[in-house]
């Protein structure tokens, strides 16, 4: 039950996170005009990954796409790439995780396959979240650098009578959306990975093999050695002395990728 809840919650958190990453990528407010020097501007500038916009006091808003690829800063291209990779990985992860959900029955899909898929989607969510966080952080770093460069420029060459006010940009709403969304996707991915460990079988389902030796019979049951999950009881190699009778495990177990023949 706890596994199902963890998996379901991981899926929902990741879904919200990926929706947030998509929203952040599409948003125009990655950087917004810094209003520190002119809080009552009649013209407000803001920029996104795909276009830059100007909103006037009149209510008129004009947006222009970046119709060049080669003319754009390499950092901007890198941020675009990171965000797109994050979205693609997240989308694939969502698709995989839907089929991996314990509450959804698809044919005779075994738990081992579901565990595999849960782990795969979890890793995808983690990488997706990291891509988003990295993309937003690179853009934020670029903004900080440009901000201080333009601040330095503002206070140089002002000997003349005419002032040229340089537009400085600061963090836009999309950065915060991106950071939060990336974090949620990452958390969702971690939850999926934890759920995967719980989905893996508790015990192996090999029958004990009887060896009839002279004197008295001893049945040996090889133990299934799986990675410790932290869920359920510890797997033990059991020696069962039962006068040559075949024995079954006390706990019913399911086939697993960790079972070896």
């Amino acid at each position: 039950m706890a596994v199902t809840a963890c998996q379901g919650l991981g899926f929902v958190v990741s879904l919200i996170g990926i929706a947030g990453i998509i929203a952040a990528t599409c948003m125009d407010q990655w950087s917004t005009q810094d209003l520190y020097n002119n809080p009552v501007t009649a013209v407000f500038n803001y920029q996104g990954l795909w276009r830059s916009c100007v909103r006037e006091s009149s209510g008129f808003t004009e947006c222009r796409g970046y119709f060049t690829l080669l003319g754009l800063p390499a950092m901007l291209q890198a941020v675009r790439a990171l965000m797109i990779v994050g979205i693609v990985l997240g989308a694939i992860g969502l698709l995989v995780s839907i089929f991996a959900l314990k509450c959804i029955r698809i044919g005779s899909m075994e738990d081992s396959a579901k565990a595999n898929m849960t782990l795969t989607s979890g890793i995808m969510f983690i990488v997706s979240g990291l891509c988003a966080i990295a993309g937003v952080s690179v853009f934020a770093n670029m903004l900080v650098t440009n901000f201080w460069m333009s601040t330095a420029n503002m206070y140089t060459g002002m000997g003349g009578m005419v002032q040229t006010v340089q537009t400085r940009y600061t963090f836009g709403a999309a950065l915060f959306v991106g950071w939060v969304a990336g974090g949620l996707t990452l958390i969702g991915g971690v939850m999926m990975c934890i759920a995967c460990r719980g989905l893996a079988p508790e015990e192996t389902n090999y029958k004990a093999v009887s060896y009839h030796a002279s004197g008295h019979s001893v049945a040996y049951k090889p133990g299934g050695f799986k990675a410790s999950t932290g869920f359920g009881s510890n797997t033990k190699n059991k020696k069962i002395y039962d006068g040559g009778a075949r024995t079954e495990d006390e706990v019913q177990s399911y086939p697993s990728k960790h079972d070896y023949v």
């Epitope: 013209v43 009149s58 005419v162």
Partner: antibody, heavy 118, light 113 residues
Framework: DVNLVESGGGLVKPGGSLKLSCAAS????????MSWVRQTPEKRLEWVAT????????YYLDSVKGRFTISRDNAKNTLYLQMSSLRSEDTAMYYC???????????WGLGTSVTVSS | DIVMTQSPSSLTVTAGEKVTMSCKSS????????????LTWYQQKPGQPPKLLIY???TRESGVPDRFTGSGSGTDFTLTISGVQGEDLAVYYC?????????FGGGTKLELK
């Protein structure tokens, strides 16, 4: 056709109050940013205040800040300018204007005269 | 505040003549975001409210004759009337539309000889 009609002007003593109104017609009033601009007896134009289309922001000339209040009633298609603590330098013709692209004022009313004198 | 300075304060011309008037701002009115200059020109005839002629420094308002041309960028702007007509006799004002307070120039009065 766009039509702006100002009213409420008149003669008032220094320190007195006056409320100007601007009735708008011929356009979707709620979708436009509106402003008040005054013209002094010396024919100098002076922007007074602006209220954005969504009533989100209001902007004022420093010399009128705290004394004048711009507001709008989108249901009545009316723009207001509440003026208090009036001074002699507030004597002017007050125009109601509509703001368009480029923050330009494309439509002006005929104005209402405000005289502050003892 | 951005200070707008217009020159000359008055111009005496003959009909059909080409006229240019200047407007200078204390700060650049060029917005880097859209590369547009937030300068507007108005015409005011006696006894009438001002009328919008040109916005974004060079964009003519609909219905304005094409003899009116706005030019310039940054801090220096010009309004040119090619072939002045009697109906053009008025006071011309430039305005900063870039930042509050929205300031006007002192005006240029156009008179006929």
């Amino acid at each position: 056709d766009v039509n702006l009609v100002e009213s409420g002007g008149g003669l008032v003593k220094p320190g007195g109050s006056l409320k100007l109104s601007c009735a708008a017609s011929g356009f979707t009033f709620s979708s436009y940013t509106m402003s008040w601009v005054r013209q002094t007896p010396e024919k100098r134009l002076e922007w007074v205040a602006t209220i954005t289309y969504g009533r989100i922001y209001t902007y004022y000339l420093d010399s009128v800040k705290g004394r004048f209040t711009i507001s709008r009633d989108n249901a009545k298609n009316t723009l207001y300018l509440q003026m208090s603590s009036l001074r002699s330098e507030d004597t002017a013709m007050y125009y109601c204007t509509r703001m368009i692209t480029g923050n330009a004022m494309d439509s002006w009313g005929l104005g209402t005269s405000v005289t502050v004198s003892s | 505040d951005i200070v707008m300075t217009q020159s000359p304060s008055s111009l005496t011309v003959t009909a059909g003549e080409k006229v240019t008037m200047s407007c200078k701002s204390s700060q650049s009115l060029l917005n880097s975001g859209n590369q547009k200059n937030y300068l507007t020109w108005y015409q005011q005839k006696p006894g009438q409210p001002p009328k919008l002629l040109i916005y974004w420094a060079s964009t003519r308002e609909s219905g304005v004759p094409d003899r009116f041309t706005g030019s310039g960028s940054g801090t220096d702007f010009t309004l040119t009337i090619s072939g002045v007509q009697g109906e053009d006799l008025a006071v011309y004002y430039c305005q900063n539309d870039y930042s509050y307070p929205l300031t006007f120039g002192g005006g240029t009065k156009l008179e006929l000889k």
